[in-house]
């Protein structure tokens, strides 16, 4: 679809007369019909194939004509057309005199005809203006004409339909050969395709609109290159999505269990040194001076009841001193003034004499000690329990209460739960918390691996986007082969498309 | 266990502008990447802003871009959501969650309720 | 953006019975679908994850279901404590978006 356009430039008629050689009276008021036709080698009449036009009267005699393309486009005159240009044309221009108001051919006498030109040729696409010429003996005319295309039509022959647009269904604007011109961050055949940020990872990002990445799940940053860890996980990354890689310290399979519990939380007090006997458990070495699970009781240096034979402690700045009963002495009251004579056993204690009579000894009953039998035995003295167990005394003996998770006589032992072998056909036992966990081989199921299952690997249907799942008997795994469009080992992520 | 725990109720006049908090704990909050989900008034649930874990680049939804600034702050477990121009419409309860704009959001706070009334 | 569609808007069972919620996404999201519950004056809680994966301590009585477009959520046996407002999401395309809920309520 194009238009020819014919500029009218000058026409001259100094004598003022018709073809027939008549003067016009009172003189010639001259208008001009067109035909637009295909080539003929000889141009002859018939129909006007590719359009007529006419004008008003233009002017009397000789006369310049004007550009005037705001009453209704009369100069340059528009031959519009819907088809294909072929490239060569006919040309016919008749002026005729117009005696009355009327131009209609029929409306004309025959001899009011002033003059006609023909010409033929070829006349490619383009702005440019070809200027002609034609004289005859009494007139002449000069005219210049072109063919352009219409708007959105382009091409050697304007028939490439190229509408410039922007939006959902292209971003472009047209070059003259009516090829798509894509605008700044678009691409692709229709020029709807954003052109992502760039360096956006080219599986894992894509975008819908230019300079933007933006992730497929399991994917985050700004280029899309950092995975996202699992839901569950709490102390670990990932190299690929949805794995929970644990940090230092941690340990279990989201990376819950703390291994390194006198890092993380330094129950440890007054200077203990804090050591990791398993997960979420630890031992503290008390400095002198300190005792308790996590060495936060400071030790009397009178707790150790250092004073013999009934003394009494006094705790002091520099350590502690003995008050000694009658009929002792010494720093722990340790030397004795008194022989049997004195009974000084107590508590039903029997007393030997020992070096003539210059001292004596004193034997116990049970449950009590001293070098008087005036203390009573307390076995928990020496805080025989371990990993936190509380001592109770019970008469002559003594037991350890132990926390959950230890057992033994001094709660020395560890419980694990994995220790009676509790996951069937060949699982393995995690030590959780407060529980234990199994993970099953190929083949079996359930809390305690005890339920058989197909081994088919493909059973779970384990690929996405209608994949066909294979399974490998010899290693009881499965392949998925993609279909197009799609890539990841369970085809997972769609290609290219957004 | 997995806590995030978010700063009190706010009442604001329009115009005014609000920082919100959310920390956390029982995770490695370094690793992982955060965001803000609003609830207005009896609605339903409407995702507002994330930011990743690695680099720190932060996503919005077109109809909040340029209100709001998501951020964090890894040496201290917290997430934040800033306003400098606060308008009635974003009147809402705001909470924090664990997770990108193409993943679950695994882990919640409790909730701020952002109030912005003449 | 992708419009999530739940129906039915409010669904009443009683205790003991079974419940099954309705996910309709506007176009394909693969599996990435989740599911949330939420009791009045709490904050939502992940009950499902891609689809059919159970979130942490949430028990074996949720299930999830589908693919592409349409997705359910089924609890076999309602407990009290399962009366709540339920909502899917989807987390394939950006921006994600939630469905509108669906209010699961005591018949």
């Known amino acids: 679809s194009g238009v020819f356009q014919l500029q009218l430039q000058e026409f001259i008629n100094e004598r003022g007369v018709l073809a027939s050689g008549r003067p016009c009276e009172p003189g010639c008021r001259t208008f001009f019909r067109v035909c637009l036709k295909h080539f003929q080698a000889v141009v002859s009449p018939g129909p006007c194939t590719f359009g007529t036009v006419s004008t008003p009267v233009l002017g009397t005699n000789s006369f310049a004509v004007r550009d005037d393309s705001s009453g209704g486009g009369r100069n340059p005159l528009q031959l519009p057309f819907n088809f294909t240009w072929p490239g060569t044309f006919s040309l016919i221009i008749e002026a005729w005199h117009a005696p009355g108001d009327d131009l209609r051919p029929e409306a004309l006498p025959p001899d009011a005809l002033i003059s006609k030109i023909a010409i033929q040729g070829s006349l490619a696409v383009g702005q440019n203006w070809l200027l002609d010429e034609q004289t005859s003996t009494l007139t002449r005319l000069r005219y210049s004409y072109r063919v352009i295309c219409s708007d959105n039509y382009y091409g050697d022959n304007c028939s490439r339909l190229c509408k410039k647009r922007n939006d959902h269904f292209g971003h472009y604007v047209c070059q003259p050969d009516g090829n798509l011109s894509c605008l700044p961050g678009w691409t692709g055949e229709y020029c709807q395709q954003p052109i992502c940020l760039s360096g956006c990872h080219e599986q894992n990002g894509y975008c819908s609109k230019p300079a933007e990445c933006l992730c497929r799940p399991g994917w985050q940053g700004r280029l899309c290159n950092e995975c996202i860890p699992h839901n569950g996980c709490r102390h670990g990354t990932c190299s690929t999505p949805w794995q929970c890689t644990c940090d230092e310290g941690w340990g279990g399979l989201f990376c819950d269990q703390d291994l390194n519990y006198c890092t993380h939380h330094s129950p440890c007090k007054n200077g203990a040194t804090c050591s990791n006997s398993g997960q979420r458990s630890y031992t503290c070495t008390c400095r002198p001076g300190y005792t308790g699970v996590d060495c936060e009781l400071e030790l009397s240096e009178c707790d150790s009841n250092p004073c013999r034979n009934g003394g009494s402690c006094k705790d002091q700045e520099d350590g502690y001193h003995c008050l000694c009963p009658p009929g002792y002495y010494g720093l722990h009251c340790e030397h004795s003034t008194l022989s049997c004579a004195d009974s000084p056993c107590f508590n039903g204690g029997s007393c030997r004499e020992r070096n003539q009579g210059a001292n004596y000894a004193c034997e116990c009953p049970p449950n009590f000690t001293g070098s008087n039998c005036e203390k009573k035995v307390d076995r928990c003295t020496s805080n025989p329990c371990a990993n936190g167990g509380q001592c109770l005394n019970r008469g002559p003996s003594r037991m350890c209460r132990c926390r959950p998770g230890f057992t033994g006589t001094y709660c020395e032992l560890h419980v694990s739960d994995c220790a009676r072998n509790p996951c069937a056909h060949g699982g393995t036992c995690h030590d959780l918390e407060n529980g234990l966990m199994c993970t099953c081989p190929a083949g079996f199921s359930g809390r305690r691996c005890e339920v058989r299952t197909s081994i088919d690997a493909c059973a779970s249907s384990p690929c996405f986007n209608r994949a066909t799942c294979y399974t490998d008997l010899s290693t009881d795994t499965f392949v998925c082969n993609c279909p197009y469009g799609f890539v990841g080992s369970r085809c997972e992520f769609p290609v290219g498309l957004p | 266990e997995v806590q995030l725990v978010q700063s009190g109720t706010e009442v604001k006049k329009p115009g005014e502008s609000l920082k919100i908090s959310c920390k956390a704990s029982?995770?490695?909050?370094?690793?992982?990447?955060m965001a803000w989900v609003r609830q207005m008034p009896g609605k339903g649930l409407e995702w507002v802003a994330t930011?990743?874990?690695?680099?720190?680049?932060?996503y919005y939804r077109d109809s909040v871009k340029g209100q709001f600034t998501i951020s964090r702050d890894n040496s201290f477990n917290t997430l934040f959501l800033q306003w400098s121009s606060l308008k009635a419409s974003d009147t809402a309860m705001y909470y924090c969650?664990?997770?990108?704009?193409?993943?679950?959001?695994?882990?919640w706070g409790q909730g701020t309720m952002v109030t912005v009334s003449s | 953006e992708i419009v999530m569609t739940q129906s039915p808007a409010t669904l009443s069972v009683s205790p003991g019975e079974r419940a099954t919620l309705s996910c309709r996404a506007s176009?394909?999201?693969?599996?990435?679908l989740a599911w949330y519950q939420q009791k009045p004056g709490q904050a939502p809680r992940l009950l499902i994850y891609?689809?059919?994966n159970l979130a942490d301590d949430v028990p074996a009585r949720f299930s999830g279901s589908g693919s592409g477009t349409e997705f359910t959520l089924t609890i076999s046996s309602l407990q009290s404590e399962d009366f709540a407002v339920y909502y899917c999401?989807?987390?394939?395309?950006?921006?994600?978006?939630f469905g509108q809920g669906t209010r699961l309520e005591i018949k």
């Open positions: 999401q989807q987390y394939n395309n950006y921006p994600p978006t």
């Open positions: 176009e394909d999201i693969y599996s990435n």
């Open positions: 930011i990743s874990s690695s680099d720190g680049t932060t």
């Open positions: 891609d689809t059919n």
């Open positions: 969650a664990r997770g990108y704009y193409n993943s679950p959001f695994a882990y």
């Open positions: 029982g995770f490695t909050f370094s690793n992982f990447p």
